[in-house]
C-alpha cells in the first residue's frame, strides 16, 4: 500500500478515503514532493505582506512587503519599516545618523565613517549622514613635489547634507 502512495506526484496527495488514489491538492493548498498523505495550506500574504508569487499545487506562495517596508526573517516572515538614507530605525521610528556615522541605504544601522588615518591616508571627501568619507592619498604623497593626477575635491562640511 505504501508503494501506491509513493507514486503520487507533487501537486497531489494519497487519499486514504479513496483507496489511496492520488487526488489533486484542493484549492489554496500544495504538495511540493511526491508521496504526501496531505497537502499543506498555502501561506497567506495578508496585511503588511503582498503576494510576490502565487501558490500553485506544487509550490507555496511567496510574500513580499508593501511599499515603505522591507522583508526580514526567513521567507519574509516580518516587514520592517523603511527609513531614508542618512537615518536608522530605532524602536521609536526613523532617526538621523549621529555625527560621524552614515547609512547609504533605506534599512540597516548607521555605521562609523572610515578612519582614513588607520590606513595612512587622508580624507579626500568629508563624510555625511548618507555617505562615508572618501580616503585619498597619504599625507606624504601630497607633500610638495609629489605629483597628483587629480586635485582633491572640495570638502563638504561634515555631517551636513540636503534632506
Amino acid at each position: 500500500l505504501q508503494d501506491l502512495c509513493s507514486n503520487c506526484p507533487a501537486g497531489t496527495f494519497c487519499d486514504n478515503n479513496r483507496s489511496q488514489i492520488c487526488s489533486p491538492c484542493p484549492p489554496n493548498s500544495f504538495s511540493s514532493a511526491g508521496g504526501q498523505r496531505t497537502c499543506d495550506i498555502c501561506r497567506q500574504c495578508k496585511g503588511v505582506f503582498k503576494t510576490r508569487k502565487e501558490c500553485s499545487s506544487t509550490s507555496n506562495a511567496e510574500c513580499d512587503c508593501i511599499s515603505g517596508y522591507h522583508c526580514l526573517g526567513a521567507e519574509c516572515s516580518m516587514c520592517e519599516q523603511d527609513c531614508k538614507q542618512g537615518q536608522e530605525l530605532t524602536k521609536k521610528g526613523c532617526k538621523d545618523c549621529c555625527f560621524g556615522t552614515f547609512n547609504d541605504q533605506k534599512r540597516g544601522i548607521c555605521r562609523p565613517w572610515t578612519n582614513c588615518s588607520l590606513d595612512g591616508k587622508s580624507v579626500l571627501v568629508n563624510g555625511t549622514k548618507e555617505r562615508d568619507v572618501v580616503c585619498g592619498p597619504s599625507p606624504a604623497d601630497l607633500s610638495p613635489g609629489a605629483s597628483s593626477a587629480t586635485p582633491p575635491a572640495p570638502a563638504r562640511e561634515p555631517g551636513h547634507s540636503p534632506q
Epitope: 495550506i41 503588511v48 526573517g73 516572515s77 520592517e80 530605525l89
Partner: antibody, heavy 123, light 106 residues
Framework: EVQLVESGGGLVQPGGSLRLSCAAS??????????VGWIRQAPGKCLEWLAL???????YYSPSLKSRLTISRDNSKNTLYLQLNSLRAEDTAVYYC???????????????WGQGTLVTVSS | DIQLTQSPSSLSASVGDRVTITCRAS??????LAWYQQKPGKAPKLLIY???NLETGVPSRFSGSGSGTDFTLTISSLQPEDFATYYC????????FGCGTKVEIK
C-alpha cells in the same frame, strides 16, 4: 503611546445582535501596514481569533464564524467595530481588540491589546 | 485550518526552575509563531514573535525556538511574576491560538 479601548459589552438576549467598538489612539487605523482585529475568550477557555481588518480595508474572518461576523472601521473616528449576529450562550466571552505587529517591525502577531469588554448572552 | 497543540496543559514549578512549554502545529508554519503571557483578568501580553524574537521590554529569561511544526518557549529561571497562562499563536494562514499552558506554583 498606542491605546485600544473596547466598549459595547453587556447582557444580550439569545438570538440578538451586538456591536462592539474599539477606540484606537497613538496610531491611525489607515496607516500602511496596520491591521487591527478582534479576539475573544470565553470564561476559563482558550483565546479565539475572530476577525481582522487592515489599512487597505481587506477583511479576514474566522471560517467557523464568518456568516455571523462583520468587521468595519470609521477612519474619521479612528474606531474599529465588530458586529456579531444570532447570538448564542456560547458567545459569552471577553472580547479583545488587538493591533497586529509591533512598532517598527510588523508581522502576523498582536503586540497591543485592549482591556477587553465582557459580553454575556443569556435570557 | 491550522491547529496548534500546546503541552503540557498545566505544570507546577518553583521559583528558579527552568520551564519549557511546547507548541506543535498541524502543518509547517515556517517561523510564523508568537508566544503570549496572560494573567487572570488581564489581556494577553506579547513575549516572543517570529518564533524567537524577544518583544521590547520582555525579560531575557524568556526565549523562543523552533520552526516548521515544533516550537518551544523556555523560561530559564522562573520568577514569582511568571506564574500565568502561556499561549502560542500562528499567523501563517489566518490566525489561530493554542489552548494555553498554565504555570502554577508547586
Amino acid at each position: 503611546e498606542v491605546q485600544l479601548v473596547e466598549s459595547g459589552g453587556g447582557l444580550v438576549q439569545p438570538g440578538g445582535s451586538l456591536r462592539l467598538s474599539c477606540a484606537a489612539s497613538g496610531f491611525s487605523l489607515s496607516t500602511g501596514g496596520v491591521g487591527v482585529g478582534w479576539i475573544r475568550q470565553a470564561p476559563g477557555k482558550c483565546l479565539e481569533w475572530l476577525a481582522l481588518i487592515d489599512w487597505a480595508d481587506d477583511k479576514y474572518y474566522s471560517p467557523s464564524l464568518k456568516s455571523r461576523l462583520t468587521i468595519s472601521r470609521d477612519n474619521s473616528k479612528n474606531t474599529l467595530y465588530l458586529q456579531l449576529n444570532s447570538l448564542r450562550a456560547e458567545d459569552t466571552a471577553v472580547y479583545y481588540c488587538a493591533r497586529g505587529g509591533s512598532d517598527t517591525v510588523i508581522g502576523d502577531w498582536f503586540a497591543y491589546w485592549g482591556q477587553g469588554t465582557l459580553v454575556t448572552v443569556s435570557s | 485550518d491550522i491547529q496548534l497543540t500546546q503541552s503540557p496543559s498545566s505544570l507546577s514549578a518553583s521559583v528558579g526552575d527552568r520551564v519549557t512549554i511546547t507548541c506543535r502545529a498541524s502543518q509547517s508554519i515556517g517561523s510564523y509563531l508568537a508566544w503570549y503571557q496572560q494573567k487572570p483578568g488581564k489581556a494577553p501580553k506579547l513575549l516572543i514573535y517570529d518564533a524567537s524574537n524577544l518583544e521590547t521590554g520582555v525579560p531575557s529569561r524568556f526565549s523562543g525556538s523552533g520552526s516548521g511544526t515544533d516550537f518551544t518557549l523556555t523560561i530559564s529561571s522562573l520568577q514569582p511574576e511568571d506564574f500565568a497562562t502561556y499561549y502560542c499563536q500562528q499567523g501563517y494562514y489566518l490566525w489561530t491560538f493554542g489552548c494555553g499552558t498554565k504555570v502554577e506554583i508547586k
